[in-house]
């Protein structure tokens, strides 16, 4: 089977972490988050060609029916596998106090 | 804010569990699954529009910096939230056995 | 619920080195965005921050006192260190550890106080 | 280094009655300033984030106010639990920096 974490379509084509530099308002928190002011976020972007970074069986069964099936199927998706936490310093009704993300930036990525 | 499971493309246009009829031989499996001969197969299909069954946090970071880079950002992608067992039958090099599979049908769907 | 606890030698002399330990729980410093800071306060003065430790290891030092100042983490025992070398009765003060988002200072600890005397 | 400055060490209030406390940063700041009250034998707690965001639990008679280098921390309907030292700090830069203080009295 070819190496699942060689992209066949040439380097960096293939899905991986990318970081993406925002601000509050590209990120639509103006509103509600004080701190930080920028974001360096982390996701997961690129193609998921077949065998590579397979999630699970469901994402092989995927890839073979579309295939078979491309306009009914779509191929798998580049989706973190996990994710990093990260503290927001956000207004709330009661003041300004610190909230813990877990599901905010991508650690590492797999195609589902 | 616009209704999380409504979709605004139009109905079925959406995230949502679709069922697929395949064979052992459109899956690939033909060669290790006795059985079942054929499989319905539940899989994640659809377009993920702004807030339509957003999973998490990174989502909406996703949604937000895809409408803002669309060339660099892609929207978010309909996957398995969550996933329902299945067993197959299959040959092994001491004969054939049942095993049971935790991620190969899709039970329900949401945006990432 | 979040809570730090400093802890330190008490007394010191003159020329030696104070080591300080920040013990904390309720909290992660492998989080984006978390850090600890130290602050001192000599008795009946004002606060002086001393050292902050990012989660990803970024350390920042008081540049008056950085030549002798070093801040460390070991994140899986949820623990800060501070040293200070060269201890002289200036230094004399109560020891804060606050723990920080981003530049958010909300929980200190209870202090640890540092006698330097001959 | 930035220097804040809390021109008055000591100030006297009566319960009830208002008071406020004025920090002055050595150079802009913007809104990167926060308070602190500190009660006699306690570590300092945090009353005001940004210049004029109450940390969550903190009683809305207390009000930040300002920007660039005039900061104001006021305090209204001033009870006796208030009898503290109040400090600002600015985290615009590093080194961060602390007012050297105000301690309220109640009279």
């Known amino acids: 089977a070819r190496n699942g974490d060689r992209c066949p379509l040439g380097p960096g084509r293939c899905c991986r972490l990318h970081t993406v530099h925002a601000s509050l308002e590209d990120l639509g928190w103006a509103d509600w988050v004080l701190s930080p002011r920028e974001v360096q976020v982390t996701m997961c972007i690129g193609a998921c060609p077949s065998q590579f970074r397979e999630a699970n069986m469901h994402a092989q069964i995927k890839m073979n029916l579309h295939r078979l099936k491309p306009d009914t199927v779509p191929a798998p998706c580049c989706v973190p596998a996990s994710y990093n936490p990260m503290v927001l310093i956000q207004k709330t009704d009661t003041g300004v106090s610190l909230q813990t993300y877990d599901d905010l930036l991508a650690k590492d990525c797999h195609c589902v | 804010a616009r209704n999380g499971d409504r979709c605004p493309l139009g109905p079925g246009r959406c995230c949502r569990l679709h069922t697929v009829h395949a064979s052992l031989e459109d899956l690939g499996w033909a060669d290790w699954v006795l059985s079942p001969r054929e499989v319905q197969v539940t899989m994640c299909i659809g377009a993920c529009p702004s807030q339509f069954r957003e999973a998490n946090m990174h989502a909406q970071i996703k949604m937000n910096l895809h409408r803002l880079k669309p060339d660099t950002v892609p929207a978010p992608c309909c996957v398995p939230a969550s996933y329902n067992p299945m067993v197959l039958i299959q040959k092994t090099d001491t004969g054939v056995s049942l095993q049971t599979y935790d991620d190969l049908l899709a039970k329900d769907c949401h945006c990432v | 619920q979040v809570t730090l606890k400093e802890s330190g030698p008490g007394i010191l002399q003159p020329s030696q080195t104070l080591s300080l330990t920040c013990s904390f729980s309720?909290?992660?410093?492998?989080?984006?965005?978390?850090?600890v800071s130290w602050i001192r306060q000599p008795s009946g003065k004002g606060l002086e921050w001393l050292a902050h430790i990012y989660w990803d290891d970024d350390k920042r030092y008081n540049p008056s006192l950085k030549s002798r100042l070093t801040i460390s983490k070991d994140t899986s025992s949820n623990r800060v260190f501070l040293k200070i070398t060269s201890v002289d009765t200036a230094d004399t003060a109560t020891y804060y550890c606050?723990?920080?988002?981003?530049?958010?200072?909300?929980?200190w600890g209870q202090g640890t106080t540092l006698t330097v005397s001959s | 280094d930035i220097v804040m400055t809390q021109s008055q060490k000591f100030m006297s209030t009566s319960v009830g009655d208002r008071v406020s406390v004025t920090c002055k940063a050595s150079q802009n700041v913007g809104t990167n300033v926060a308070w602190y009250q500190q009660k006699p034998g306690q570590s300092p707690k945090g009353l005001i984030y940004?210049?004029?965001y109450r940390y969550s639990g903190v009683p809305d008679r207390f009000t930040g106010s300002g920007s660039g280098t005039d900061f104001t921390l006021t305090i209204n309907n001033v009870q006796s639990e208030d009898l503290a030292e109040y400090f600002c700090q600015q985290y615009n830069s590093y080194p961060y920096t602390f007012g050297g203080g105000t301690k309220l009295e109640i009279k």
């Open positions: 940004s210049a004029s």
């Open positions: 606050a723990r920080t988002g981003w530049d958010f200072f909300d929980y």
């Open positions: 309720g909290f992660s410093l492998s989080t984006s965005g978390m850090g």
